[in-house]
């Protein structure tokens, strides 16, 4: 099994992931590990020799890089906020603030806007990555109600008056609860004639 | 060389506020970010937050948030950790520090008194 | 948040003692921990980071090791100057934690 450098006819190297094709002497190289680059170059009697990024700079992979990539911080003015440090292994980790959604996407997201209003009687779809998409409003299923415009408010189920031990006054809808009322308050007057019957 | 040099002791009444500064100096004050680390009589390290004084940008620990705001002048190359509604559980070593996988430079702490 | 567990709280050790204390993180958190040195009145200081890397200036008898969840530091043979109190963090992810701490006593 041969060790980097060694000759290789066919342009290509048995690890492609830590290894590298050298075409000027024809050579499979070391690549460098995450968090370091390359000081000096393989030879055919000599293997790449890597050093340690220095602080504030990293490289994510295996690499035959000259240099390490400078971290930056995420852009708040594009919505994003910080969620992990730049190490020299990795670049920031960064995702949209709460109540933004990812609008433009380049290989990581680089600018959120605000989540849309879902209006009462709605809710927003769960959905399985945070700051992934916009807001789908769904409608709060039965038994439940939601009665605020907001992009975060989720549908509460009514208020079920019997466990407090009182009665129901007027029933829950989507958007609004249920009313109870005390069951020895008298009924309105409207409703006062069903009674002595 | 890295220094991190701090502001004096303070005496605060529960309620008030207090503001601590760090004056940064032998590196690019814009391009490292500085945290603030506090530290309980006998207890363990608790991690406050940071700015990026490039874009004077803070983010904090949602343990503070609300109380405690972190600034930066550039102009002075100094950061300023600024607490508020103190209360006795507040009395603690407010450290600054520059980070780097981890933090290899501190400043030498601020030790703040809370009674009233 | 990453809960971060040292053991043990604190610990009796003579000069010459090889000493190792363990950290054990909630949640995975690679190899982003790092190990300070902490004497009274004093700030901590910076030994490992990377879990493994031994700060520059930090004597050889110092060392780290692990990844994902349970790190450890040790110390080869224990020196005066190394009585004092060790703490572990991550720098993974917002909020940085750190572990409670280990007192490190003179027997």
């Known amino acids: 099994q041969a060790v980097p450098p060694y000759a290789s006819e066919n342009q290509t190297c048995r690890d492609q992931e830590k290894e590298y094709y050298e075409p000027q002497h024809r050579i499979c190289c070391s690549r460098c590990p995450p968090g370091t680059y390359v000081s000096a170059k393989c030879s055919r009697i000599r293997d790449t020799v890597c050093a340690t990024c220095a602080e504030n700079s990293y490289n994510e992979h295996w690499n035959y890089l000259t240099i390490c990539q400078l971290c930056r911080p995420c852009d708040p003015v594009m919505g994003l906020e910080e969620i992990a440090p730049c190490t020299s292994k990795r670049k920031t980790q960064c995702r949209c603030q709460p109540g933004m959604f990812c609008a433009a996407w380049a290989l990581e997201c680089t600018h959120c806007e605000l989540l849309s209003d879902c209006p009462p009687g709605t809710e927003a779809e769960l959905k399985d990555e945070v700051g992934k998409g916009n807001n789908h409003c769904v409608p709060c299923k039965a038994g439940h109600f939601q009665n605020t415009s907001s992009p975060s408010a989720r549908c509460q189920p009514h208020t079920r008056c019997e466990n407090q031990g009182l009665v129901e006054a007027a029933p829950g809808t989507a958007q609004s609860d249920t009313t109870c009322k005390n069951p020895l308050e008298p009924l309105p007057p409207e409703m006062s004639g069903t009674m002595l019957m | 060389q890295v220094q991190l040099v701090q502001s004096g002791a303070e005496v605060k009444k529960p309620g008030q506020s207090v503001k601590v500064s760090c004056k940064a100096s032998?590196?690019?004050?814009?391009?490292?970010?500085l945290h603030w680390v506090r530290q309980a009589p006998g207890q363990g390290l608790e991690w406050m937050g940071w700015?990026?004084?490039?874009?004077?940008?803070?983010q904090y620990n949602e343990k503070f948030k609300g109380r405690v705001t972190i600034t930066a002048d550039k102009s002075t190359s100094t950061a300023y950790m600024e607490l508020s509604s103190l209360r006795s559980e507040d009395t603690a070593v407010y450290y600054c520090?520059?980070?780097?996988?981890?933090?290899?430079?501190w400043g030498q702490g601020t030790t703040v008194t809370v009674s009233s | 948040d990453i809960q971060m567990t040292q053991s043990p709280s604190s610990l009796s050790a003579s000069v010459g003692d090889r000493v190792t204390i363990t950290c054990k993180a909630s949640q995975n958190v690679g190899i982003n921990v790092a190990w300070y040195q902490q004497k009274p009145g004093k700030a901590p200081k910076l030994l490992i980071s990377?879990?493994?890397y031994r700060y520059s200036g930090v004597p050889s008898r110092f060392s780290g090791s692990g990844s994902g969840t349970d790190f450890t530091l040790t110390i080869s043979s224990l020196q005066p100057e190394d009585f004092a109190t060790y703490f572990c963090?991550?720098?993974?992810?917002?909020?940085?934690?750190f572990g409670q701490g280990t007192k490190v006593e003179i027997k």
């Open positions: 990377s879990a493994s």
């Open positions: 963090q991550q720098y993974d992810t917002y909020p940085f934690t």
């Open positions: 032998g590196y690019t004050f814009t391009t490292y970010y």
């Open positions: 520090a520059r980070s780097w996988e981890g933090f290899p430079y």
């Open positions: 700015i990026y004084p490039g874009n004077v940008h803070a």
